[in-house]
Interface confidence: low
């Protein structure tokens, strides 16, 4: 018994929250709350936006965004996509691991042009030490952060 | 691998399915099938639609539930709130964990006015013995209860 | 130390991407790539699209598949449905074990009739030893594959 | 800034085929349809269809069925109208625009001329 | 089929408000769009979804609808308005696009 739950205490785990300081606008990945409220890091490392690997294997990783503006303006892009990316020192490019795409300003109601929607990502992916995971949005304008429970990301390892 | 067998049997998990009772009305959170057909507990409790820790550690957490209607009432929010929130004696007021805002309704499409959609929350979050995790919809009659398999609501340590 | 990493090692996974092949036409269930990119067996095999459980015990299943299309053809059913199901030699026919109904064409925005949506499901279930899980849409017509980080399917041993 | 520019004009004889491009700068071609709308001197505007670059989908008005084939060279981000069996009656400006059922941006028209 | 009306024309005195109509069997359950066309030029988009104004449209430029009628109203009418006005929606499917007759708007 307490071979297992020393086991538990050493898997590396991280759930990592939104925050008003996620959301950049300068191209780069979303940023994430490492320590307050609900976030942690346990056998995991952080760096600008990126969960690195301390310990080579599979990984669980995921991500929820929350989604959301006031009708579809027709400068807007109708097509939103969310992902999870790896970056690793093999490539020079972040390498696409989970993606999806979505088209929510479409989902506002008759009697009402608010809208929101949500995507969450999941998947198992290896990860060498050193290896980064990271999240983009695009278009990241239509993130709606709040209290660190509607976008989030996180991995445990498997 | 006796030693790793032991310790994969013993780590808590349960998924817990949606049934006719799931829906209250009385404002409380849903409530959950725990032993009939896919559902069970291995080293966790159920109480009142709640899953009770029995252990402390990191929990990865999920619930999906399945959304219909016909046409957006305008009576009906437009916005619906699916979440995932904790009990603690440490606390009066239940915590937020994961939650999602959608806008379902105004899925109708131009020649049907019945919609189907579907939330998806996951994410880990640490548990101390006695914490309690239960899933709220609101407006939860929009829920769509079938067979256990649209609307679920489960956790694993990790 | 040893002991851990051997358990890990050993735990059973598997991530299958989406390829060309895996949309059939015919009924069945979507097939997958196991080896290619991200895609990995480990402790688990594959056949015919399906996951074959190669240990006993609970398992965390999972599947995302991107829907997309153009417009909403009066001809196509408005219901997209995404569901993990169970093939065990105890049963003639298969066993659903999460599933998702959505409503997807109504997404399409005002100027630009291409809409996009994604499904996630996720869920413990249990399988005994030769017991598979597949995936199934109805109307698989509106999956769009890419490269496999779109429309996947995977497993742990929870 | 979004800009479609059509080619230039022609004059065709009747029983013959004219071919009309529509060349899409300014925003990712394959994200939006091209509709072609024709107008005739004097007259009101008649939608003709619509194709989806990205994925080729196509549909047209009823009357065109059978005459008209709408396609497209992503490679350039061209969109290109069809139109078969030519009549007087088809003496029109022909348009393109950009868009679902929000038709945003329009070409400056392309005048096709039928006959004999 | 289908279809889309419209009065043939309109005329206002400078400064006065134009309203054009276009009533339609299905409108209470489509959106309506507004073109405005000069002599010799391509249609522009000035009211799309019913009531919505793309950027650079004059905000005199207004839309409603409400049943079977959709309305463009033009507050405060200028000479430079002077156009053919057509709306337009789409049918049952949201596949094909109906125009309206068009308008003709005079402004004195």
């Known amino acids: 018994l307490i071979q297992e739950r020393r086991s538990h205490q050493n898997n590396p785990a991280a759930h990592l929250t939104g925050a008003n300081s996620s959301l950049t606008g300068s191209g780069g990945p979303l940023l994430w709350e490492t320590q307050l409220g609900l976030a942690f890091l346990r056998g995991l490392d952080y760096h600008d936006g990126a969960l690195v690997a301390n310990k080579a294997g599979y990984y669980y990783i995921y991500s929820k965004v929350q989604l959301g503006g006031v009708g579809c303006p027709l400068g807007l892009a109708s097509t939103i996509t969310h992902g999870l990316y790896k970056r690793t020192p093999r490539y020079p490019e972040e390498l696409e691991l989970l993606v999806s795409q979505q088209s929510p300003c479409g989902r506002a109601t008759s009697n009402s042009r608010v809208w929101w929607d949500s995507s969450f990502l999941g998947g198992v992916v290896h990860l060498e030490v050193g290896e980064e995971v990271v999240v983009r949005v695009l278009d990241e304008r239509l993130v709606r952060l709040r209290d660190g429970t509607r976008s989030y990301f996180g991995a445990f390892m498997v | 691998l006796i030693q790793e067998r032991r310790s994969h049997q013993n780590n808590p998990a349960a998924h817990l399915t949606g049934a006719n009772s799931s829906l209250t009305g009385s404002g409380g959170p849903l409530l959950w099938e725990t032993q009939l057909g896919l559902a069970f507990l291995r080293g966790l409790d159920y109480h009142d639609g709640a899953l009770v820790a029995n252990k402390a550690g990191y929990y990865y957490i999920y619930s999906k539930v399945q959304l219909g209607g016909v046409g957006c009432p305008l009576g009906l929010a437009s916005t619906i709130t699916h979440g995932l929130y904790k009990r603690t004696p440490r606390y009066p007021e239940e915590l937020e964990l994961l939650v999602s805002q959608q806008s379902p309704c105004g899925r109708a499409t131009s020649n049907s006015r019945v919609w189907w959609d579907s939330s998806f929350l996951g994410g880990v979050v640490h548990l101390e013995v006695g914490e309690e995790v239960v899933v709220r919809v609101l407006d939860e009659r929009l829920v769509r209860l079938r067979d256990g398999t649209r609307s679920y609501f489960g956790a694993f340590m990790v | 130390l040893i002991q851990e990493r051997r358990s890990h090692q050993n735990n059973p996974a598997a991530h299958l991407t989406g390829a060309n092949s895996s949309l059939t036409g015919s009924g069945g269930p979507l097939l997958w790539e196991t080896q290619l990119g991200l895609a990995f067996l480990r402790g688990l095999d594959y056949h015919d699209g399906a996951l074959v459980a190669n240990k006993a015990g609970y398992y965390y299943i999972y599947s995302k598949v991107q829907l997309g299309g153009v417009g909403c053809p009066l001809g196509l059913a408005s219901t997209i449905t995404h569901g993990l199901y169970k093939r065990t030699p105890r049963y003639p026919e298969e066993l659903e074990l999460l599933v998702s109904q959505q409503s997807p064409c109504g997404r399409a925005t005002s100027n630009s009739r291409v809409w996009w949506d994604s499904s996630f499901l996720g869920g413990v279930v249990h399988l005994e030893v030769g017991e598979e899980v597949v995936v199934r849409v109805l109307d698989e017509r509106l999956v769009r594959l890419r490269d496999g980080t779109r429309s996947y399917f995977g497993a742990f041993m929870v | 800034q979004v800009l479609l520019v059509q080619s230039g004009a022609e004059v065709k004889k009747p029983g013959a085929s004219v071919k009309v491009s529509c060349k899409a700068s300014?925003?990712?071609?394959?994200?939006?349809?091209i509709n072609w709308v024709r107008q005739a001197t004097g007259q009101g505007l008649e939608w003709m269809g619509w194709?989806?670059?990205?994925?080729?989908?196509?549909d047209y008005a009823q009357e065109f069925q059978g005459r008209v084939t709408m396609t497209r060279d992503t490679s350039i981000s061209t969109a290109y109208m069809e139109l078969s069996s030519l009549r007087s009656e088809d003496t029109a400006v022909y348009y393109c625009?950009?868009?679902?059922?929000?038709?945003?941006?329009w070409g400056q028209g392309t005048l096709v001329t039928v006959s004999s | 089929s289908y279809e889309l009306t419209q009065p043939p024309s309109v005329s206002v005195s400078p400064g006065q408000t134009a309203r054009i109509t276009c009533s339609g069997d299905?409108?209470?359950?489509?959106?309506a769009y507004w073109y405005q066309q000069k002599s010799g030029q391509a249609p522009v988009l000035v009211i799309y979804?019913?009531?919505k104004r793309p950027s650079g449209i004059p905000e005199r430029f207004s839309g409603s609808s409400s049943g079977t009628m959709a309305t463009l109203t033009i507050s405060g009418a200028q000479v430079e308005d002077e156009a053919d006005y057509y709306c337009?929606?789409?049918?049952?499917?949201?596949?094909?696009?109906?125009f309206g007759g068009g308008t003709k708007l005079t402004v004195l």
């Open positions: 299905a409108l209470p359950k489509k959106y």
């Open positions: 337009y929606s789409t049918d049952s499917s949201d596949n094909h696009v109906i």
């Open positions: 300014g925003y990712t071609f394959t994200h939006f349809d």
């Open positions: 625009a950009r868009g679902g059922t929000t038709l945003d941006y």
């Open positions: 194709m989806n670059p990205d994925s080729d989908n196509t």
């Open positions: 979804e019913d009531s």
